[in-house]
C-alpha cells in the first residue's frame, strides 16, 4: 500500500536569465528512494539514481545542475522554460510516486516565489 | 571493459526446461538493472524480463510470464533466466543486456541460441 | 501495451544519403526512447538514447529527435558500415516494447 505523499514547491516564478530550484520531498513513508527522474512535459532532464548517480541529459547540460539533494536547478531561464516539471520518486516497495510543479517564467525583474516549504 | 556473456542455451523439447546465465564483468554489477531481450529467428526484438537494479524488482512480457524467472546473484555479477514449460516460440537468441537508469540498454552480451524443438 | 510503430520497414540508399526512420509510439512516452544498431549475427548496439542523446563512441552523423508520441532517427550522411537493421525501443512503461525495425539496404 502507498502511504507516501509528494511535497512540492508548488507553482513557482523567476525571472528570465535568473536560476530557480526544482524540489520535491517524500514524505510519510519509510520507502526507500532508489531513482528520481526530473521531467519536463515530454523531456527527460536528469535522473538521480542512489548507486549511479545523477545523469544530466546533454542537451540541457549547460543549463541544468545536480542539486540540492534530490533537487534540481535550472539556469539561465528563457521564457520557453515556462510549463510543467515533474519529479517522479522510484521507491521500495511502494512503487511510483509523482510530484508536480508549474513554473513560470517571466520577463520582468518582479517575480514571487511561492514555496510550499522551505529548501534546506 | 564492460562485457556480458551468455550461456545455457541449446537444444530442448517442448514442455522441458533450461537456465540461461549471463555473466558480467567491467562494471559494478549491482549498480544496474538486467534485462533479457530475444530475437526469433528472422524476426525482431523482442524484450522478456528486466530486473532492477537494487529492489529486485521483476517485470516480464506476458508471454512469458508464469513460466520464466529472472534473477541474479550480485556476488556472482550474474543474471539468470529460468525457463519452463518452453514452447516451439520461445526458439530465439536470448541476449542480456544492461540498463542504466532502467532506461535505456547500453551493453548487450553476444546471445545464446535457444531451440524448441522435438 | 504500448505499440512502436517504426517506417519504413525497409529503404535503399546510397553511401552519402540522408536517411530518415521514424518511431510512433501509440501514447505518449515522453522521451524514453532509445535507438539501436543491429547487424547481421551481432548483437544490438545503443545508438541514441533519451530521444537525443547520443550513446558514447557512436558517430555523429547519428542524430535523434522528438518527444510525446514522434520520433525520428537521421542519418546525415550514410557510409558502409551503416548498412543494418534499426530498431527503437521504449522505456516508459512495461512492458518495454521495440519497434518492428527498419533494414537500411544499399541501393
Known amino acids: 500500500m502507498m502511504t507516501g505523499t509528494i511535497e512540492t514547491t508548488g507553482n513557482i516564478s523567476a525571472e528570465k536569465g535568473g536560476s530557480i530550484i526544482l524540489q520535491c520531498h517524500l514524505s510519510s513513508t519509510t520507502a526507500q528512494v532508489t531513482q528520481v527522474n526530473w521531467e519536463q512535459q515530454d523531456q527527460l532532464l536528469a535522473i538521480c539514481n542512489a548507486d549511479l548517480g545523477w545523469h544530466i541529459s546533454p542537451s540541457f547540460k549547460d543549463r541544468v545542475a545536480p542539486g540540492p539533494g534530490l533537487g534540481l536547478t535550472l539556469q539561465s531561464l528563457t521564457v520557453n522554460d515556462t510549463g510543467e516539471y515533474f519529479c517522479i520518486y522510484h521507491t521500495y516497495p511502494d512503487g511510483t510516486y509523482t510530484g508536480r510543479i508549474f513554473l513560470e517564467v517571466l520577463e520582468s525583474s518582479v517575480a514571487e516565489h511561492g514555496a510550499r516549504f522551505q529548501i534546506p | 571493459e564492460v562485457q556480458l556473456l551468455e550461456s545455457g542455451g541449446g537444444l530442448v523439447q517442448p514442455g522441458g526446461s533450461l537456465r540461461l546465465s549471463c555473466a558480467a564483468s567491467g562494471f559494478t554489477f549491482d549498480s544496474y538493472g538486467m534485462n533479457w531481450v530475444r530475437q526469433a529467428p528472422g524476426k525482431g526484438l523482442e524484450w522478456v524480463a528486466s530486473i532492477k537494479y537494487s529492489s529486485g524488482y521483476k517485470y516480464y512480457a506476458d508471454s512469458v510470464k508464469g513460466r520464466f524467472t529472472i534473477s541474479r546473484d550480485n556476488s556472482k555479477n550474474t543474471l539468470y533466466l529460468q525457463m519452463n514449460s518452453l514452447r516451439a516460440e520461445d526458439t530465439a537468441v536470448y541476449y542480456c543486456?544492461?540498463?542504466?537508469?532502467?532506461?535505456?540498454?547500453?551493453?548487450w552480451g553476444q546471445g545464446t541460441l535457444v531451440t524448441v524443438s522435438s | 501495451d504500448i505499440q512502436m510503430t517504426q517506417s519504413p520497414s525497409s529503404l535503399s540508399a546510397s553511401v552519402g544519403d540522408r536517411v530518415t526512420i521514424t518511431c510512433r509510439a501509440s501514447?505518449?512516452?515522453?522521451?524514453?526512447l532509445n535507438w539501436y544498431q543491429q547487424k547481421p549475427g551481432k548483437a544490438p548496439k545503443l545508438l541514441i538514447y533519451a530521444a537525443s542523446s547520443l550513446q558514447s563512441g557512436v558517430p555523429s552523423r547519428f542524430s535523434g529527435s522528438g518527444s510525446g508520441t514522434d520520433f525520428t532517427l537521421t542519418i546525415s550522411s550514410l557510409q558502409p558500415e551503416d548498412f543494418a537493421t534499426y530498431y527503437c525501443q521504449q522505456s516508459y512503461s512495461t512492458p518495454l516494447t521495440f519497434g518492428g525495425g527498419t533494414k537500411v539496404e544499399i541501393k
Open positions: 501514447q505518449s512516452i515522453s522521451s524514453y
Open positions: 543486456a544492461r540498463g542504466p537508469y532502467d532506461v535505456w540498454m547500453d551493453y
